[in-house]
């Protein structure tokens, strides 16, 4: 069964910067990745970035840079302009569309006790689902 993992980390140098890392564990070929926050894409979540392997990337504030790390993983840098650091309690979700598995999505957030530079373990959360 394919899995999606999500890691959220706070940058050690800049406490207002966060990075979301997502990856797809499965044999398929990724055709699209959607990153959202506040919940899954299309289920209350707000889109932050969309990445296609050839057509490029599209991102929306507060996303700063979305990029492919490997053929099956991406990273999204976020700039927190507010003083109260709302990202700390936010859920980030990544949805991978792949062939032949279809769409798989998982969510993660910054661990409550996170020190700068520490990240959530790369384990999928139970809301993993296929469309």
């Amino acid at each position: 069964t394919p899995e999606v993992w999500v890691q959220v980390q706070m940058e050690a140098t800049e406490l207002s910067s966060f990075t979301v890392h997502c990856g797809f564990l499965g044999p398929g070929s990724i055709s699209l990745v959607t990153v959202s926050w506040g919940g899954p894409d299309g289920a209350g979540g707000t889109k932050l970035a969309v990445l296609h392997p050839e057509l490029g990337t599209r991102q929306w504030a507060p996303a700063r840079q979305a990029r492919w790390e490997t053929q099956s993983s991406i990273s999204l840098a976020l700039e927190d302009s507010g003083a109260s650091s709302p990202f700390a309690n936010t859920t980030f979700c990544c949805k991978f569309a792949s062939f032949p598995e279809g769409s798989w999505e998982s969510c993660g957030s910054l661990p409550p006790s996170s020190d700068p530079g520490l990240s959530a373990p790369p384990t999928p959360v139970p809301i993993l689902r296929a469309d």
Epitope: S31, V50, E54, L55, R58, A97, S103, D131
Partner: antibody, heavy 122, light 107 residues
Framework: QVQLVQSGAEVKKPGASVKVSCKAS????????IYWVRQAPGQGLEWMGH????????DYAQKLQGRVTMTTDTSTSTAYMELRSLRSDDTAVYYC???????????????WGQGTLVTVSS | DIQMTQSPSSLSASVGDRVTITCQAS??????LNWYQQKPGKAPKLLIY???SLHTGVPSRFSGSGSGTDFTFTISSLQPEDIATYYC?????????FGGGTKVEIK
């Protein structure tokens, strides 16, 4: 290079069905969608629907719902569009085009197939 | 459905002229708008995507601008090979819709 090649012209009687094929080459078929657009003689362009090659998910124009079926064969990188219960106003050139695997983003059509003329006449 | 109103429906201009075509959406489509060129008997060809991005290999005399509901397509210096019909297309919402087309002729 990226190319879409469509099947040849068809002449059909009212009430019949037609199935047009669109063979893709030069790119990863499952990274994109195939969109179908038709053009009646001397008229503009009309979106008929599309299929996402990675999943087989489809969206169809409301006016064609129930009469149109779009499918893909990923083993041959070929898309198909079947239109049933043909009427004279279905006479048109039918185009397939490569588009995004999500209609919401990156959704420009490039390239297009050469077109397939379907004539519906009794 | 989002209606795309394209104007003019036809125009005649001289070689070297600046040609402008407008497309108005009935609702906000952000910059989800593309422009195509279609020559008689041929399939359409993509010129501009996402309102203002020039597609690879398309001459720089073609350009696009706009956002929201109002969009403009410009040929800065009309060439004989530009004789064609031009269409705008939105993908901000389903169904995907096209403008009615603008036929460009040489005077």
């Amino acid at each position: 290079q990226v190319q879409l090649v469509q099947s040849g012209a068809e002449v059909k009687k009212p009430g019949a069905s037609v199935k047009v094929s669109c063979k893709a080459s030069g790119y990863t078929f499952t990274h994109y969608g195939i969109y179908w657009v038709r053009q009646a003689p001397g008229q503009g362009l009309e979106w008929m629907g599309h299929i996402y090659a990675y999943s087989g998910d489809t969206d169809y124009a409301q006016k064609l719902q129930g009469r149109v079926t779009m499918t893909t064969d990923t083993s041959t990188s070929t898309a198909y569009m079947e239109l049933r219960s043909l009427r004279s106003d279905d006479t048109a050139v039918y185009y397939c085009a490569r588009g995004s695997p999500t209609y919401e983003h990156f959704n420009w059509f490039d390239p297009w197939g050469q077109g397939t003329l379907v004539t519906v006449s009794s | 459905d989002i209606q795309m109103t394209q104007s003019p429906s036809s125009l005649s201009a001289s070689v070297g002229d600046r040609v402008t075509i407008t497309c108005q959406a009935s609702d906000d489509i952000s910059d989800y708008l593309n422009w195509y060129q279609q020559k008689p008997g041929k399939a359409p060809k993509l010129l501009i995507y996402d309102a203002s991005s020039l597609h690879t290999g398309v001459p720089s005399r073609f350009s696009g601008s706009g956002s929201g509901t109002d969009f403009t397509f410009t040929i800065s210096s009309l060439q004989p090979e530009d004789i064609a019909t031009y269409y705008c297309q939105q993908y901000g919402n389903l169904p995907i819709t096209f403008g009615g087309g603008t036929k460009v002729e040489i005077k």
